[in-house]
């Protein structure tokens, strides 16, 4: 029966005399008068089984003590730690030259675990053991014995086990503890590779190459290897493993990404929070699911936010010229969170009596610069039929539009070819300019060509260069443009619309808003 004693993780104990409860019962030769098993108290008042011999008065002592058989458990080199105490020869009563202060350590390899007798000739000498410290009888006071600790190693061993023997040649000595152990490199995890318990090599300089196996939920990047050194220390880690997708390294393990996190690839990166507009509901996510109404394009990385189709283009303007139509519009208010926005034009030819009966325009119609994938916000459509109703749809599209096409993503206009539109307006005036508004007025076109249904005012900041404009429609020949920025130059165009369509825009009127209110009467020229 052995009690538990704590030793370093890289040592595996094969024998520990201090852990044995009761008598050790080792074999002594001679049976009496030599080594004697004695129980003493240690510093914690716990009994320890020790072997002592003190035949210091007679010369030519040859007292042997042999351990029980010790299995080697596959170890090729074992270590023997001996704790012993030795009395100074000078402290012994009447002793002269017969007293020694050393003893000898021997071993004998054997497959037989039940050898009953000590045959001295079978044993090989490991070393002569001398004390670093011996003591006089006065030194033993306060129960503090001067313990010497000596460690020797022996190998390579090849048989199933071995016996140790201690030869006394006339010392006054006690073996307080004998521990036999071998060294191993303990199971460890390095670079996410697990290396098993590995017994050290036969030589004190040998290195044992060990291949590691990737921990759960990881895969090899480079073949993981380490070397087990003779002292039981792992050396020179080579190669590594990486946590699989959906897992990250934590304390040498690959843990599943938490809910709300993901990892797309086998890398040494940590799990990342789900990108905007996405979520994960399970641990170990390799990607995050897009929120309802949000999507990920085929070539979008898992790290990109989920996006949605854009809203409809704004401010669609048409200009009919016989069998040609020019269309212009503004970017959608919501791009869906993407940069890859483009526009598609859908042309439908509709019956005069029933506008709902429309058919695709066909291949005879031409679009400049193109019909689909437009990057600009204008298109010219030519080769239309005369006296025909056409409906044009402008669709805003991005990389995820195909996942959720909806009429909400388009704006349309219906025109009739070959009807004369009104002429352009000759004079536009700024009646009043304040910090935040401009009051405009204009004359009816010289040639209305029908009933003027409404006027359309297009304006924009001069330095925006028509990239971002706004439209105001009115039935009157004047309007107040509000919500402007002070001290800013604006450009204004006005055109009229009849049933035949829009006329051309007027010449630009440039007006700069004030810092203080004032009245300016425009005369058609640029006002400042």
């Amino acid at each position: 029966v052995t009690g538990s004693r704590v030793y370093p993780a890289n040592e595996v104990t094969l024998l520990d005399s201090r852990s044995v409860q009761g008598e050790l019962g080792w074999i002594a030769s001679p049976l009496e008068g030599g080594w004697e098993e004695v129980s003493i108290m240690d510093e914690k008042n716990t009994p320890i089984r020790t072997y002592q011999v003190c035949n210091v008065m007679e010369a030519s002592q040859n007292n042997w003590l042999r351990t029980d058989w010790i299995t080697r458990e596959g170890a090729q080199r074992v270590y023997i730690e001996i704790k012993f105490t030795l009395r100074d020869c000078n402290s012994l009563p009447g002793v002269m030259g017969t007293c020694k202060e050393t003893f000898n350590l021997y071993y004998y390899e054997s497959d037989n675990d039940k050898e009953r007798f000590i045959r001295e000739s079978q044993f090989g000498k490991i070393d002569t053991i001398a004390a670093d410290e011996s003591f006089t009888q006065v030194d033993i006071g306060d129960r503090i014995m001067k313990l010497n600790t000596e460690i020797r190693d022996v190998g390579p061993l090849s048989k199933k086990g071995f016996y140790l023997a201690f030869q006394d040649v006339g010392a006054c000595i006690a073996l307080v503890s004998v521990r036999v152990f071998y060294k191993k490199c303990p199971l460890t995890v390095r670079n996410l590779a697990q290396f098993p318990d590995t017994i050290t090599g036969a030589d004190t300089s040998s290195l044992v190459e060990v291949r590691g196996s990737c921990v759960n939920n990881s895969e090899e990047k480079d073949v993981p290897k380490m070397y087990c050194g003779a002292d039981g220390e792992w050396l020179v880690p080579i190669g590594n493993c990486l946590c699989n997708a959906g897992h990250e390294e934590q304390n040498g393990e690959c843990q599943a990404c938490k809910i709300g996190y993901y990892k797309a690839l086998s890398t040494d990166a940590s799990c990342a929070k789900c990108p905007p507009h996405s979520y994960s509901v399970w641990e170990g996510a390799t990607s995050c699911t897009c929120d309802r109404g949000f999507f990920r394009a085929d070539n979008d990385a898992a790290s990109m936010p989920c996006t949605r189709p854009p809203s409809a283009p704004l401010n669609l303007i048409s200009n009919v010229n016989e069998t040609s139509v020019n269309l212009e519009w503004s970017s959608p208010q919501n791009t869906g969170g993407r940069q890859d926005i483009s526009y598609n034009v859908v042309c439908k030819k509709c019956g005069a009596g029933d506008p709902s009966k429309c058919r695709p325009c066909g291949s005879g119609v031409h679009y400049t610069p193109q019909q689909n994938g437009l990057k600009t916000t204008r298109v010219s459509i030519t080769d239309l039929l005369a006296h025909t109703n056409y409906t044009f749809e402008i669709w805003a599209v991005n990389g995820v539009s195909k996942y959720n096409p909806s009429p909400d993503q388009s704006v349309s206009v219906t025109v009739t070819t070959n009807q004369a539109a009104p002429s352009s307006i000759a004079l536009v005036q700024a009646k009043e300019v304040t910090r935040y508004s401009v009051a405009l007025a204009w004359l009816e076109p010289d040639r209305p060509n029908g009933v003027i249904l409404e006027y359309e005012v297009k304006y924009y900041e001069k330095d925006q260069n028509e990239r971002s404009y706004r439209i105001v429609r009115t039935a009157a020949r004047n309007t107040d443009i509000k919500g402007l920025n002070p001290l800013t130059s604006y450009v204004f165009h006005v055109r009229a619309r009849t049933a035949a369509g829009y006329g051309d825009f007027s010449e630009p009127l440039e007006v700069t808003t004030n810092t203080v209110p004032s009245r300016i009467i425009g005369d058609g020229a640029n006002s400042t």
Partner: antibody
């Protein structure tokens, strides 16, 4: 078994000498030192000294030098205590005791039965 | 030389009781202090040696402890055959005994 056998009581006159034998049996005589202890009537134990049975080298305690001699005859495994110029205060039981020397200290593990020496005129 | 003082000089106990004997040294000595028992008309016999190792044939009701200058011999339950004189001994360069404690029937 291990035994130390001492002679019977001795009655001596002051100034005389006495030689007390201690015969050992049951172990190798020369392997253990022999100690001598005195016990005056009604008194405690008093260590007199020892002799190395292997070399014959004696060690005397303070107060037991001069008139006290330890000697050996290894051929008959016997140790001797000789007291000369006996005085009345030498009246005591004299014990021989085998010295057990261990790592953990020295003691006397086997004792003779004692020899009473009476000094009286 | 080192003087060992034992106390009490006489200890009166009834059979079955616990007896505690003290031995005090004039200076620090080894903790491996031997104790001896001597019955009237008999030679002393070794009782305890080492730190607290009982000699052959000594029952386990005898135990010893102590270190430095103060030592104790304890008889856990005194038996009739334990009534005797008990001596402690130190084995410095010059060996000495305590003057003894007599354990007698109460």
């Amino acid at each position: 078994q291990v035994q130390l056998l001492q002679s019977g009581a001795e009655v001596k006159k002051p100034g005389a000498s006495v030689k007390v034998p201690c015969k050992a049996s049951g172990y190798t005589f020369t392997s253990r030192a022999m100690s001598w202890v005195r016990q005056a009537p009604g008194q405690g134990l008093e260590w007199m000294g020892w002799i190395n049975t292997n070399t014959g080298n004696p060690t005397y305690a303070q107060g037991f030098t001069g008139r006290f001699v330890f000697s050996l005859d290894t051929s008959v495994s016997t140790a001797y205590l000789q007291i000369s110029s006996l005085k009345a205060e030498d009246t005591a039981v004299y014990y021989c005791a085998r010295v057990r020397t261990t790592v953990y200290g020295d003691n006397m593990d086997v004792w003779g039965q004692g020899t009473l020496v009476t000094v009286s005129s | 030389e080192i003087v060992l003082t034992q106390s009490p000089a006489t200890l009166s106990v009834s059979p079955g009781e616990r007896a505690t004997l003290s031995c005090r040294a004039s200076q620090s000595v080894s903790s491996n202090l031997p104790w001896y028992q001597q019955k009237p008309g008999q030679a002393p016999r070794l009782l305890i040696y080492g730190a607290s190792t009982r000699a052959t044939g000594i029952p386990d009701r005898f135990s010893a402890s102590g270190s430095g200058t103060d030592f104790t011999l304890t008889i856990s339950r005194v038996e009739p055959e334990d009534f005797a004189v008990y001596y402690c001994q130190q084995y410095g360069p010059s060996w000495t005994f305590g003057q003894g404690t007599k354990v007698e029937i109460k």
